[in-house]
């Protein structure tokens, strides 16, 4: 429970948290985990420890492994681990994402992108930062202390964005980067509530009695990323579990995002051997979200069969 | 048949809370949203707020953000609309109604709310 | 929020005759689906709030085909095509199309 992933580039400086919080006034030792081996204080080695910090000044490949804290106080010791890795920098733009920080979404209105892990440094500003790898120039990007600005935010401002900055630590300086990702919330013409395209409201099916049929609901929620969208078949007012037929079963469809951005999604009620009793139910495609639900009501006709002979 | 059965008038103190409650019958309270809307003496009706059932969210306009709480519970078929920080212009009939997806098709009694000195 | 206007506000009527309540809306209610969501709600006298008319056009179950809907985007309207005594009360549109829903100010309909 009390382990921290962290994670660095090599020549880098890489500082880690103990997991384990305590008053300033604790002492903190740290250990190599695999060897039991205390992590020196002294400020002159390349790793070292400083009260809850553990200082790699800059990192190396082989320092990855998992480091043990132990934090003492008069009448209790906690234990946390800090599990970190290293990694060798790439010579491509691209950030893989295990050197990703947590994913920040911004809109219009809100667009912040804070630089994660820089409160641990002793850094000065401005902070350097660059989007997919592009400094970033125009008056829309400001750098303000640990956070980057961006006015008028667009979906194309959405990417990977990298901060930079330099720690000094006793008249030494060492480089730090860091980036996650920005997502936009399009809040222009944003619709709220859950759109069902099909089926029609009211639709009447027509299936053939003994064969097999499928009805798809499908649903649009809004653009981007949606939270607590769904959609379900329901009969007679009932989820299909509750209601108990096994010939009638749905399955989720495809996740879709159309070119205009819009997120849907598709469930498909399958209804095996289709029989007399089914074309008394009533079909409801239900579709919500956050803001609300719609539903659409389907009944089953039976399709005559075509007559060969007349 | 379809019945939403609300709870019986209040009066309240400014600055008090309100909590109504709404008991769904004759149909399946889990499958169906709740919206409540109120209306002043004399006045027009006012969505307040709504609960979207399965993913047991609730949704509130931004004038009663903070002030107004939706739940339901599904083992007894209820709904219920605390209003908190009452103020005498909070004096209404408080409805609960059915969402049968994006309109109300059943409505309750009404529930009057007196805020009063 | 999205503004409802109704007109008129109050509409004296004569039994047999017809009527028709407009409501208009500050932004479309057509939504990419084709469904206009906009509803029609009456109240009678001391009475709750009832649906007449879903999706701009659809009667509801157990209302008299006397009551139609039409209109698309920002215009609405509801017809009555011959009114009885039990039809006065104060009617509202609402739409359901933006967040938040939100009522019109209501037509009071009354027997002249």
């Known amino acids: 429970k009390f382990s921290k992933q962290s994670w660095g580039l090599e020549n880098e400086a890489l500082i880690v948290r103990c997991p384990r919080q305590g008053k300033p006034s604790y002492t903190v030792d740290w250990y190599y985990s695999q060897t039991n081996k205390s992590i020196p204080t002294q400020e002159r080695n390349r790793v070292f420890a400083s009260g809850q910090l553990l200082k790699f000044l800059p990192a190396a490949v082989a320092d990855s492994g998992i480091y043990t804290c132990i934090v003492r106080s008069p009448t209790f010791n906690r234990t946390g681990y800090a599990n970190v890795t290293i990694y060798k920098k790439q010579s491509d733009c691209n950030v893989p994402d295990y050197l990703m920080y947590s994913t920040v979404s911004g809109s219009e209105k809100n667009s912040k992108i804070y630089c994660p892990t820089i409160d641990l440094y002793n850094w000065t500003a401005p902070l350097e930062w660059f989007k997919n790898c592009q400094a970033l120039q125009g008056s829309r990007y400001r750098a303000h202390k640990s956070f980057l600005v961006i006015d008028n935010v667009m979906t194309e401002d959405a990417g990977d964005y990298t901060c930079k900055f330099i720690h000094n630590e006793n008249g030494a300086n060492y480089s730090v980067t860091a980036t996650r990702s920005f997502t936009v919330k399009d809040e222009q013409g944003f619709s709220l509530f859950p759109v069902i395209g099909a089926p029609a409201q009211n639709e009447i099916k027509e299936v053939e009695i003994g064969k097999n049929a499928n009805l798809t609901c499908s649903a649009c929620f809004g653009k981007g990323t949606q939270f607590l969208a769904a959609v379900l078949w329901q009969l007679n007012g009932t989820k299909i579990t509750d209601f108990g037929e096994p010939r009638i079963q749905q399955e989720e469809g495809q996740n879709q995002s159309f070119s205009n951005g819009l997120a849907c999604l598709d469930m498909v009620l399958r209804i095996a051997d289709v029989k007399e009793e089914d074309l008394l139910l009533q079909y409801d495609c239900l579709a919500l979200n956050l803001h609300g639900l719609r539903r659409h009501t389907v009944r089953l006709s039976r399709k005559n069969p075509i007559d060969h002979h007349s | 048949q379809v019945q939403l059965v609300q709870s019986g008038a209040e009066v309240k103190k400014p600055g008090s809370s309100v909590k109504v409650s709404c008991k769904a019958s004759g149909f399946s309270f889990s499958t169906y949203g709740v919206a409540w809307v109120r209306q002043a003496p004399g006045q027009g009706l006012e969505w307040m707020g709504g609960?979207?059932?399965?993913?047991?969210?609730?949704n509130y306009a931004q004038k009663f953000q903070g002030r107004v709480t939706i739940t339901a519970d599904e083992s007894t078929s209820t709904a219920y609309m605390e209003l908190s920080s009452l103020r005498s212009e909070d004096t209404a009939v408080y409805y609960c109604?059915?969402?049968?997806?994006?309109?109300?098709?059943?409505w309750g009694q009404g529930t009057l709310v007196t805020v009063s000195s | 929020d999205i503004v409802m206007t109704q007109s008129p506000l109050s509409l004296p009527v004569t039994p047999g005759e017809p009527a028709s309540i407009s409501c208009r809306s500050s932004?479309?209610?057509?939504?990419?689906?084709?469904?206009?969501?906009l509803d029609w709600y009456l109240q009678k006298p001391g009475q709750s709030p009832q649906l007449l008319i879903y999706a701009a056009s659809s009667l509801q179950s157990g209302v008299p085909d006397r009551f139609s809907g039409s209109g698309s985007g920002t215009d609405f309207t509801l017809k009555i095509s011959r009114v009885e005594a039990e039809d006065v009360g104060v009617y509202y549109c609402?739409?359901?199309?933006?967040?938040?829903?939100?009522f019109g100010q209501g037509t009071k309909v009354e027997i002249k």
């Open positions: 932004q479309s209610l057509l939504h990419s689906n084709g469904y206009n969501y």
């Open positions: 109604a059915r969402d049968y997806g994006g309109n109300l098709d059943y």
């Open positions: 609402m739409q359901g199309a933006h967040w938040p829903p939100t």
């Open positions: 609960f979207v059932p399965i993913i047991g969210s609730a």
